[in-house]
Interface confidence: low
Amino acid sequence: KSPIFGPEEVNSVEGNSVSITCYYPPTSVNRHTRKYWCRQGARGGCITLISSEGYVSSKYAGRANLTNFPENGTFVVNIAQLSQDDSGRYKCGLGINSRGLSFDVSLEVSQGPGLLNDTKVYTVDLGRTVTINCPFKTENAQKRKSLYKQIGLYPVLVIDSSGYVNPNYTGRIRLDIQGTGQLLFSVVINQLRLSDAGQYLCQAGDDSNSNKKNADLQVLKPEPELVYEDLRGSVTFHCALGPEVANVAKFLCRQSSGENCDVVVNTLGKRAPAFEGRILLNPQDKDGSFSVVITGLRKEDAGRYLCGAHSDGQLQEGSPIQAWQLFVNEESTIPRSPTVVKGVAGGSVAVLCPYNRKESKSIKYWCLWEGAQNGRCPLLVDSEGWVKAQYEGRLSLLEEPGNGTFTVILNQLTSRDAGFYWCLTNGDTLWRTTVEIKIIEGEPNLKVPGNVTAVLGETLKVPCHFPCKFSSYEKYWCKWNNTGCQALPSQDEGPSKAFVNCDENSRLVSLTLNLVTRADEGWYWCGVKQGHFYGETAAVYVAVEERKAAGSRDVSLAKADAAPDEKVLDSGFREIENKAIQDPRLFAEEKAVADTRDQADGSRASVDSGSSEEQGGSSR
């Protein structure tokens, strides 16, 4: 399939001009190669009319030009002084006319409508509003005002000042008579239909001295705006329908066969299953405008999209609409990355996120798509050191491996982490990508203790068991903080019995903290990686407490002796607190993609009970 894209149909009227934009993948070769516009002949050839190398056919001399915009990957053909002879089939393309790197364009030039003298022409888009102005003289100021539509040979009354409204216009027409100073009345028709098009006559008075004014109303289907996006990338449809529909339900639909337009998303909560996890309808402004973002573009997403406003949340006659023709370029600059990543409860995932490598300094973000209402994507983490409070200790965004890819690691997984996540930056919005995290049956490969309490001034060693399949990987321990996970020295300890099915080849790597201080308290991760590519991780919280005074009872015994409802401020408390921190849905604050960072994001943990086995699948 050719990656060149342009308008399938261009329509104009004799004497007017057209501007035709053709899109191409902006590779180095494409940017510099010849661009052309040619007319297709009956026998299959294509005669060049204008090219980027300076050629202009005699038919186009003085009325056409071709301009290349290499930085955008577009070129534009402007043709003026159109005649009906210009109607025909054309190609815009790159290279040699016959090579197939082209797009077919149909140009249709119509005769202007034959109109009566003194006819005011109103050209209005489908679904919009028209105001027909009707002047009159003083002697007709007190007389009946009316608007007629010419149906066949006869005028049919549409509305008059005595209160009559033609049934075809009920609820969408009014007649306004201006103040006494102005000799003018107006007829306002809303929610214009294609059938409203035609010739109208407004009249003040009914006798031979009446004032008459002819009007020609043309109702046009909006020409689609061309949108050219890369496979796996993102597209944003900005829909501005006007303040008069600010409080009406909005929709985006995709045209299928004939007049059908299948709802993709609407403000009444409907969303097509094919767009689950990869679409957002951004809240509308006071003026009724809104936007829809679709990520993870697929070949089958190409087509014609309409946005509109109607109380039903779908396309109906009289809906004001905007149209787009989306082309999905399969010669994508966006690299393939997994669209589904699987993890087990208590385990972890490492997600690779592509970004435009020209924008290495951009801020990277990761957000969780939520389908409720119109869809939203509250931020969870960014590359500037912000992490949503309830994800502390289990989520990190790393700039590695760099050069067009960053990594997001999420551990302590629960079933509630299943869902769709978006990778994005504050730079090129086309590089938003979607990944689905699925939680599957299984055990985490890395095993760490559920809770660890260190004592001030003492040494702490925390084991991390890993199976033989990771023997060739680099193992590490790191201390988690908002900006990442700082690597620490670790020590290979030899065989371990944690994985009985692994023939003594299961190994452990331990974290050692000498002379523990208060600063050592926090989350630590054990992980495996290959070069700059991260694998699994397991997290453990290290609490730090005072050294016990001589003769005091050991805390671990206190826990065993405690009555069921007695409060024990030891590792058991920390365990419950960890559970709350691990649960990503126990907090109400949200951070939307467009929000500024809220530094006052501290929140209280909700306490709920549960064993450490439920939380992390850790071995003791």
Epitope: E8, Q111, Q150, S195, Q218
Partner: nanobody
Amino acid sequence: EVQLVESGGGLVQAGDSLRLSCAASGRTLSFDTYAMAWFRQAPGKEREFVASIDYNGGSTDYADSVKGRFTVTRDNAKNTVTLRMNSLKPDDTAVYYCASARYYRSGTSFPVNYWGQGTQVTVSS
């Protein structure tokens, strides 16, 4: 361009019925964006409007002389428009032309951008 080809004309008796068809071909990538119409031209007379239909068949319009006798329909899946003519009269004798337009306008001033070649209908008394 759009090519319009009419068919179904012929010689019939007064009171009979006839069905004219118009097939659109060529650059008909989105036939449903064209309004369509039928016109006719009797010998020695000007071409006159007969009937029109909008993009999806939601709106139709007829000349007074054919109202109640003629019906225009379209099938966007097949790129065709049809004129069903009942209770034919000798006055209906003419060459019938199919026409397309970029926008729909009811009434006799249909904004034609393409014409067919025409098909002859003769109604004998």
